[in-house]
C-alpha cells in the first residue's frame, strides 16, 4: 500500500502500512516523513540516505530495537526526530552522528536507563530533549551537557528519579543555561540535597505529582533553596495519587527561591487560608491557580504584589473579593461557583478576561465595576445574562471588547458604546441582541473589527447603523435573519475589507449597497436564498473585490434570469468554490452547477 | 460489527463497538461496574494513541430510547498544565491510566442508552477514536 502524499513532494504519511524496510519510492525532495507504527525493528547505517532533504522524521512505535552507527548519517537538514515507544536495546555510540541541524529529539518510552550513555553530546543545535516515560534513576546531568548550549527544554517526567544531589547539576554551574525549562513531574522524589539548586538559573521548573506526603514535599521544596526560576509550576494530576494533607508549611521553603511567575496546577484539596499558604509568593509578578478549590474568597483582597493573576477552572463558594493595587492582568476563566459578578477594586488593571464562567452581571459596565480607568482589554464572552446599564463611563481606554455567546440585555435602549472612541475590536456575536436603535454603535470611531453574527434586527432589515465606523475593516453580519438592507447601510465604510453576509435570508443580490466600499476584498453571501438580482441591470462590485462567495444559494436557472446568470459567469474570477453553486429551480436542472449551464433562451421557449 | 463487553452491574449492562474505520485497540475496564442509581468507582484505560493527546476533547452524542440529546463537547485537555497526566501523552506512547468517578442522585428510566464518544485531539484536530457505548438499564427498584 502506498504512502499518503499530504503535500506533494514534501510530506508523506506512511503510518501503519506494515513496512519492514524504509520505502525507497518517495521523492528525494521529501521533507516530512511519518513512518510510525511500522515494524522496522532495525536501523542500519545510512538508513535514510535516500532522503537528503528530510527535516522531520517520525519513527514512533516502529519496534526498533537496534540503531547502528550512522543510522541517520546524511540527514544534515533534520530538525526533528521522534522515536517514541521504541523498545531500544542497542544504541550505538554513533547512532545520532551526522544530525548537524537537529533541534528536537523525542525519545519517550524507549527503555532509556541513563542519560550518561545516551550518545547525544555532539548535538550542539539541540533545543528540546524529551526523555519522559523512561527508566532513568539518576538526575546527574552528564558532562556532555556543556556542549548543548542551545538546550531550552529538558523533559524528564515519568522516570524513576528519587534523589537530587549537589553534584548532579554541576554542569549547569559551568555553563548556565539561562533559558532551560525542566520538567521533573511524576518522578517519585523523596530527597533534594540542600544546595543542589544554589545559584542555578532556570526558565521553568515543573514539579507535579512528585511527592507522596506533605513532609516529603516540604523537605524537597526546602532543597530547592537558592534556585532562581522564571516560572515555577507545582501541583498534582487528577488521575494520579494525591496528597492526603496539604497546609501552609508545604510551601514555606519557597521563601528561599527567586521566582518571577508561580502556578499551582490541580490540587485535590480545599485551600482555605491562602494568605498564609502563599506567604512566600506575595511578590511574584504572576500568580496562577488552575483546577483548585478555594474556600475563603476574601483572601484575594490582601496586599499581594502580583501584576498578573490567573484563576482557571477553579471552584469558588462565591465570586472572589478582589482588591489588588498592583494587578495589571486578571484572567478568571472557566471557573465554577459564584455565579453573580461582584465589584472588584483593581486600580492598575489593563487586561481582564472573565470568559466562560456562566456569570451574570446586574449592571455593566463602568469604572466602578472594575475599580480601574486603565482597562484596555475586556472579555466577558460565554457568560450568562449581562444587563447593560451604563455606557462604559471611566473605561474610555478600552481597545478590545468581547461579549460573544453571553446574553446581552438593554442593548437597544441607549448608545451603549458611546464612550469607547479607542475601541478597535468588538464581538457581540450570538448575544441575543435585537437591533432596534440606529445609534447602537455611536461613538466607535476607531473600531476596525465588528463581529455581530447570530443576532437579529427589527423587521429583519439592516438600517444605517454603521455611519460612524469609518475605520472598520472587518464586519460579520452572518446568521442575522436579514432579508433586506438599507441601500446606504455601508456608505461610510470606505476601509472595509471583509464583509460576511452569509447565512441570512436574502432572496436577491444587489450591487448598489456596496458601491462605496473601495477597499472591499472579501464578500460572503453563501447560505442565503439568492435566486436572482434585485434589479435587471447589475453593476460591478468595487474593483478591489477579490473573493465573492455565492455558494449554497437557490439559483433560478431559467430564461427570465438569463442576464443574472450571465452576470454570475462574468464574475467567475472572483467566485470561490464554484462547484457548490448549484441550480435550485427548475426541478430538471436542480443540482446542476450554475457555471456549467449553457442558458440559451431558445431552449426554454 | 464486533461488540466488546465491558461489565454488568445490578441495574446495567455495558458494551461498546467501534464507530470508526481504524478500530485501534483500546482496553476499558470499570471497577466496580457502573450502577445508574448511584456509582463510585475506577475507570481503567490502556491505549496507544495514534496522535498526541494534547487538546483532547470528546464529542458525546447520547440517545435515550431512540431520542437524540443535543451534542455535548467535553474538553479533557486544554493544552498546558492540564488536570490529567495522560494529556501529555505522545503519539505511540502507552497510556495506562486509572480515573476515579462518582455520581449520585440521577434517576434514569428503563431502556437502552447509546452514547457515541468521538475523541478528537491534536493540532490540526483529527479524530483519535470513536466508540459507541450501549447501556441497557434495568432498574431493580423504583
Amino acid at each position: 500500500e502506498p504512502c499518503v502524499e499530504v503535500v506533494p513532494n514534501i510530506t508523506y504519511q506512511c503510518m501503519e502500512l506494515n513496512f519492514y524496510k524504509i520505502p525507497d519510492n518517495l521523492p528525494f525532495s521529501t521533507k516530512n516523513l511519518d513512518l510510525s507504527f511500522n515494524p522496522l525493528r532495525h536501523l542500519g547505517s545510512y538508513s535514510f540516505f535516500s532522503f537528503p532533504e528530510l527535516q522531520v522524521l517520525d519513527l514512533s512505535r516502529c519496534e526498533i530495537q537496534t540503531i547502528e552507527d550512522g543510522a541517520y548519517q546524511s540527514l544534515s537538514h533534520l530538525s526533528t526526530l521522534i522515536l517514541t515507544g521504541n523498545p531500544i536495546q542497542s544504541l550505538a555510540l554513533g547512532a545520532f552522528s551526522g544530525l548537524s541541524s537537529l533541534q528536537k529529539l523525542v525519545a519517550v518510552e524507549t527503555n532509556l536507563a541513563s542519560l550518561e550513555n545516551f550518545p547525544i553530546g555532539h548535538l550542539k543545535t539541540l533545543k528540546e530533549l524529551n526523555v519522559a516515560h523512561n527508566l532513568i534513576q539518576s538526575f546527574k546531568l552528564p558532562e556532555y551537557f556543556s556542549n548543548l548550549t542551545n538546550l531550552e527544554h529538558l523533559d524528564l517526567s515519568s522516570n524513576k528519579i528519587q534523589s537530587i544531589y549537589c553534584t548532579d547539576l554541576r554542569v549547569l554551574h559551568q555553563m548556565p543555561l539561562l533559558n532551560l525549562s525542566l520538567d521533573l513531574s511524576l518522578n517519585p522524589m523523596n530527597f533534594i540535597q540542600p544546595g543542589a539548586f544554589k545559584e542555578i538559573r532556570l526558565h521553568k521548573l515543573t514539579l507535579r505529582n512528585n511527592f507522596d506526603s506533605l513532609n516529603v514535599m516540604k523537605t524537597c521544596i526546602q532543597g530547592l533553596a537558592g534556585l532562581e526560576v522564571h516560572r515555577l509550576v507545582l501541583g498534582e494530576f487528577r488521575n494520579e495519587g494525591n496528597l492526603e494533607k496539604f497546609d501552609k508549611s508545604a510551601l514555606e521553603g519557597l521563601c528561599n527561591l527567586t521566582i518571577e511567575e508561580f502556578r499551582l496546577a490541580y490540587l485535590d484539596y480545599y485551600l482555605d487560608d491562602i494568605i498564609d499558604l502563599f506567604n512566600c509568593l506575595t511578590n511574584v509578578s504572576s500568580f496562577s491557580l488552575v483546577s483548585v478549590t478555594i474556600e475563603r474568597v476574601k483572601d484575594f483582597s490582601y496586599n499581594f504584589g502580583w501584576q498578573h493573576l490567573e484563576l482557571v477552572n477553579c471552584k469558588f463558594g462565591q465570586f472572589p473579593t478582589l482588591k489588588l493595587k498592583s494587578l495589571k492582568r486578571l484572567t478568571f476563566t472557566s471557573n465554577k461557583g459564584g455565579n453573580a459578578f461582584s465589584e472588584v477594586d483593581l486600580p492598575s488593571l489593563e487586561f481582564l478576561d472573565l470568559s466562560r464562567n456562566g456569570l451574570s452581571f446586574k449592571g455593566c459596565c463602568s469604572q466602578s465595576d472594575f475599580g480601574t480607568t486603565s482597562l484596555k482589554y475586556l472579555d466577558l464572552s460565554f457568560n450568562g445574562v449581562i444587563t447593560m446599564s451604563s455606557n462604559f463611563l471611566g473605561l474610555e481606554q478600552l481597545e478590545h471588547l468581547d461579549f460573544q455567546h453571553s446574553n446581552l440585555k438593554q442593548m437597544s435602549e441607549f448608545s451603549v458604546f458611546l464612550s469607547l472612541r479607542n475601541l478597535i475590536y468588538l464581538d457581540i456575536s450570538h448575544t441575543h441582541t435585537r437591533v432596534a436603535f440606529n445609534g447602537i454603535f455611536n461613538g466607535l470611531s476607531s473600531l476596525e473589527v465588528l463581529k455581530m453574527a447570530g443576532n437579529s434586527f427589527q423587521e429583519n432589515f439592516l438600517p444605517d447603523i454603521f455611519t460612524e465606523l469609518r475605520n472598520l475593516t472587518f464586519l460579520d453580519l452572518s446568521q442575522c435573519q436579514l432579508e433586506q438592507l438599507s441601500p446606504t447601510a455601508f456608505n461610510s465604510l470606505s476601509s472595509l475589507q471583509v464583509l460576511n453576509m452569509s447565512h441570512n435570508n436574502f432572496f436577491s443580490l444587489d450591487t448598489f449597497p456596496y458601491k462605496c466600499l473601495n477597499s472591499l476584498q472579501v464578500l460572503d453571501y453563501s447560505l442565503n436564498h439568492i435566486m436572482t438580482s434585485k434589479k435587471q441591470e447589475l453593476q460591478h462590485f468595487p474593483s478591489s473585490l477579490a473573493f465573492l462567495n455565492l455558494t449554497q444559494n437557490d439559483f433560478a436557472c431559467t430564461c427570465e434570469h438569463q442576464s443574472f446568470l450571465q452576470w454570475i459567469k462574468d464574475q467567475r474570477q472572483l467566485l470561490v468554490e464554484v462547484e457548490r453553486m448549484e441550480c435550485a429551480t427548475p426541478s430538471d436542472k436542480q443540482g446542476m452547477p450554475v457555471l456549467s449551464l449553457n442558458i440559451t433562451c431558445q431552449m426554454n421557449k | 460489527q464486533k461488540q466488546y463487553w465491558v461489565c454488568n452491574s445490578s441495574d446495567a449492562s455495558i458494551s461498546y463497538t467501534y464507530c470508526d474505520k481504524m478500530q485501534y485497540p483500546i482496553s476499558i475496564n470499570v471497577n466496580p461496574c457502573i450502577e445508574l442509581k448511584r456509582s463510585k468507582g475506577l475507570l481503567h484505560i490502556f491505549y496507544i494513541p495514534r496522535r498526541d493527546l494534547k487538546q483532547l476533547y470528546f464529542n458525546l452524542y447520547i440517545t435515550v430510547n431512540t431520542m437524540n440529546l443535543p451534542k455535548r463537547k467535553e474538553v479533557i485537555c486544554r493544552g498546558s498544565d492540564d488536570d490529567y497526566s495522560f494529556c501529555r501523552a505522545l503519539k505511540g506512547e502507552t497510556v495506562n491510566t486509572t480515573i476515579s468517578f462518582s455520581f449520585k442522585g440521577i434517576k434514569f428510566s428503563k431502556g437502552k442508552y447509546k452514547c457515541v464518544v468521538e475523541a478528537i485531539s491534536g493540532s490540526p484536530e483529527e479524530m483519535l477514536f470513536c466508540l459507541e457505548f450501549v447501556i441497557l438499564h434495568q432498574p431493580n427498584s423504583n
Epitope: 524496510k21 525507497d24 519510492n25 528525494f28 542500519g44 547505517s45 545510512y46 535516500s50 546524511s74 | -
Partner: nanobody
Framework: EVQLVESGGGLVQAGESLRLSCVAS????????MGWYRQAPGKQGESVAI???????YYPDSVKGRFAISRDNAKNTVYLAMNSLKLEDTGVYYC??????RGQGTQVTVSS
C-alpha cells in the same frame, strides 16, 4: 557480510576530472539505493550523489551539472564521474548502500 571497495581517487588540479568506482560484494546491488557521501576535514559531511533502483538520481546544488552517478548491476558496481572539479570538492568519498553501510573511502584532493 556486505563489503564495499572504492577506487579512483587521487590528486588532481582544479577543473580536471575523476571517475570513482565502488564494487560491492556479499549483496546484489540491483535492489539497493546507492550513492556517494563525502567528508572534508572540519566540514559537515554531505551526500553528493544518490541513485535509486529505478535509476532516478539526486545531486545537491553544490555538484549539480558536474557530477554524474551511474550503476552497473551486472558488475555490482556504482560509479561517480566528477568533472570541473573545484578546491571545495576535496575530501574522503565514501560509497554508500542505504541501510547497509559504507566502504573505507577514497581520498580526492583538488589543488590549485
Amino acid at each position: 557480510e556486505v563489503q564495499l571497495v572504492e577506487s579512483g581517487g587521487g590528486l588532481v588540479q582544479a577543473g580536471e576530472s575523476l571517475r570513482l568506482s565502488c564494487v560491492a560484494s556479499g549483496i546484489s546491488i540491483s535492489t539497493e539505493v546507492m550513492g556517494w557521501y563525502r567528508q572534508a576535514p572540519g566540514k559537515q559531511g554531505e551526500s553528493v550523489a544518490i541513485i535509486k533502483t529505478d535509476g532516478s538520481t539526486y545531486y545537491p546544488d553544490s555538484v549539480k551539472g558536474r557530477f554524474a552517478i551511474s550503476r552497473d548491476n551486472a558488475k555490482n558496481t556504482v560509479y561517480l564521474a566528477m568533472n570541473s572539479l573545484k578546491l571545495e570538492d576535496t575530501g574522503v568519498y565514501y560509497c554508500i548502500i542505504a541501510g547497509r553501510g559504507r566502504g573505507q573511502g577514497t581520498q580526492v584532493t583538488v589543488s590549485s
